[in-house]
Interface confidence: medium
């Protein structure tokens, strides 16, 4: 906390500029007026103040709004920023997406901060969903802004809001955010053709269900081994080698380095050797020619 | 993070020169605002001279005319010539990043200006 000093003689600052670069602490606190700060937050940016001095110049705010700042405030506070605090970010109604871009753009290159995460939240709460434009610029700012939230989170997402999803933002997503999105995918990219529906739908496709990589496997798609190991194990298991082999197309051959691996090794165990041989790919592991595959899943469903 | 070394200080009678240099380690040098500050016996650190990334000056009323700052990029260092030395100028010399990314904490040893009269 700054001490309450008369402002010296001729001090009084006439406008934010770079002359107040040299004054004390103490003489920006009595000489800035906080209401010509507020109207001259752009000019603040521009001027290298040190992390002391936009201490005293946002104390200074903070007693001209105690209630949180007003949005022609928040859109230039741009370094100001680093200071704030999560408590008083949940003070703001943050609505205008150029705000948002402008307060990023402080943080831009740096992991999220509390500060940064807060900010969001408010701004994706005060707009009831995340839109389009909104995820557009979360991920331009952080590609793995969509794998942070919860599945519960993520369930807001407008359909209309996947085609702003590139492949990298999906990097870190778990099976359980895919599970959420893949649905929300196969919505926004519907009326796409065969291949470029394949090209928009493969990042997601962690989260398809058995019956779509089915369909997927009659389509000439040649899906990379890098996408099939992505897949739920759950999805894969009921595949049959035929399905598989025209799923993969030429990539099939890839299966071999993946055997030890799931989910291919879960894959090779419910098939039957025999299907497995017609690969050529010398992968072992399937059920014995002569055995008996009993369905334990649809027994249980039976008794 | 920058570590900055200041040199060139020394003992000079009032109206002659010292040209002051503070080299800096790190990469992102270039892309920060610079000052030279100083410390007199008993008072507190007062910022003299503050140069952009670009290459823009300000300086203290206290040394306007007399005092140039001036940085070579490619060699990291900030320059800070001082001509017409006056006694009230003894202290002892800092530089530091002026970026509001950088907290200001982090201070080298400084290089004492003394003037004698």
């Known amino acids: 906390e700054v001490e309450k000093t008369a402002c010296p003689s001729g001090k009084k600052a006439p406008e934010i500029d770079e002359s107040l670069i040299f004054y004390k602490k103490w003489e920006l606190e009595a000489c800035v007026d906080a209401a010509l700060l507020a109207t001259q937050m752009d000019r603040v940016n521009a001027i290298p103040f040190t992390y002391e001095q936009l201490d005293v110049l946002k104390h200074k705010l903070d007693e001209l709004y105690p209630q949180g700042y007003p949005e022609s405030v928040i859109q230039h506070l741009g370094y100001l920023f680093l200071k704030m605090s999560p408590e008083d970010i949940r003070k703001w109604n943050v609505t205008s997406l150029e705000t948002l871009k402008a307060l990023l753009e402080v943080n831009k290159g740096h992991e999220m901060s509390p500060q940064v995460a807060t900010l969001i939240d408010r701004f994706v709460k005060g707009r009831g969903q995340l839109d389009k434009d909104t995820l557009d610029t979360l991920t331009a700012f952080y590609p793995g802004y969509l794998c942070s939230l919860s599945p519960e989170e993520l369930s807001s997402v407008p359909p209309s809001s996947i085609w702003a999803v590139r492949p990298q933002d999906l990097d870190t997503c778990d099976p359980r955010q895919l599970d959420v999105l893949y649905p929300k995918a196969r919505l926004a990219f519907q009326n796409m053709n065969g291949s470029e529906y394949f090209v928009k739908i493969q990042s997601f496709l962690g989260g398809a269900p058995t019956e779509d990589l089915k369909a997927l496997s009659q389509q000439n798609v040649s899906m990379d081994l890098a996408t099939f190991m992505k897949l739920r194990t759950d999805a894969v298991l009921p595949l049959t080698v035929a399905e598989v082999q025209k799923l993969l197309g030429p990539h099939v051959e890839g299966l071999k380095a993946e055997e030890r691996h799931r989910p291919v090794r879960d894959w090779i165990l419910r098939q039957r050797q025999d299907d497995l041989d017609t690969l050529g790919l010398g992968l072992q592991g399937g059920i014995p020619n002569g055995y008996l595959v009993l369905d334990l899943s649809m027994q249980e469903a039976l008794s | 993070e920058v570590q900055l070394v200041e040199s060139g200080g020394g003992l000079v009678q009032a109206g002659g020169s010292l040209r002051l240099s503070c080299a800096a380690s790190?990469?992102?040098?270039?892309?920060?605002?610079m000052g030279w500050y100083r410390q007199a016996p008993g008072k507190q650190r007062e910022l003299v001279a503050a140069?952009?990334?670009?290459?823009?000056?300000n300086y203290a009323d206290s040394v306007k005319g007399r005092f140039t700052i001036s940085r070579d990029n490619a060699k990291n260092t900030v320059y800070l010539q001082m001509n017409s030395l006056k006694p009230e100028d003894t202290a002892v010399y800092y530089c530091?990043?002026?970026?509001?990314?950088?907290?200001?904490?982090?201070w080298g040893q400084g290089t004492q200006v003394t003037v004698s009269s």
């Open positions: 790190g990469s992102t040098f270039s892309s920060y605002p």
């Open positions: 140069i952009s990334s670009g290459g823009s000056t």
């Open positions: 530091n990043t002026r970026s509001p990314r950088v907290p200001n904490d982090s």
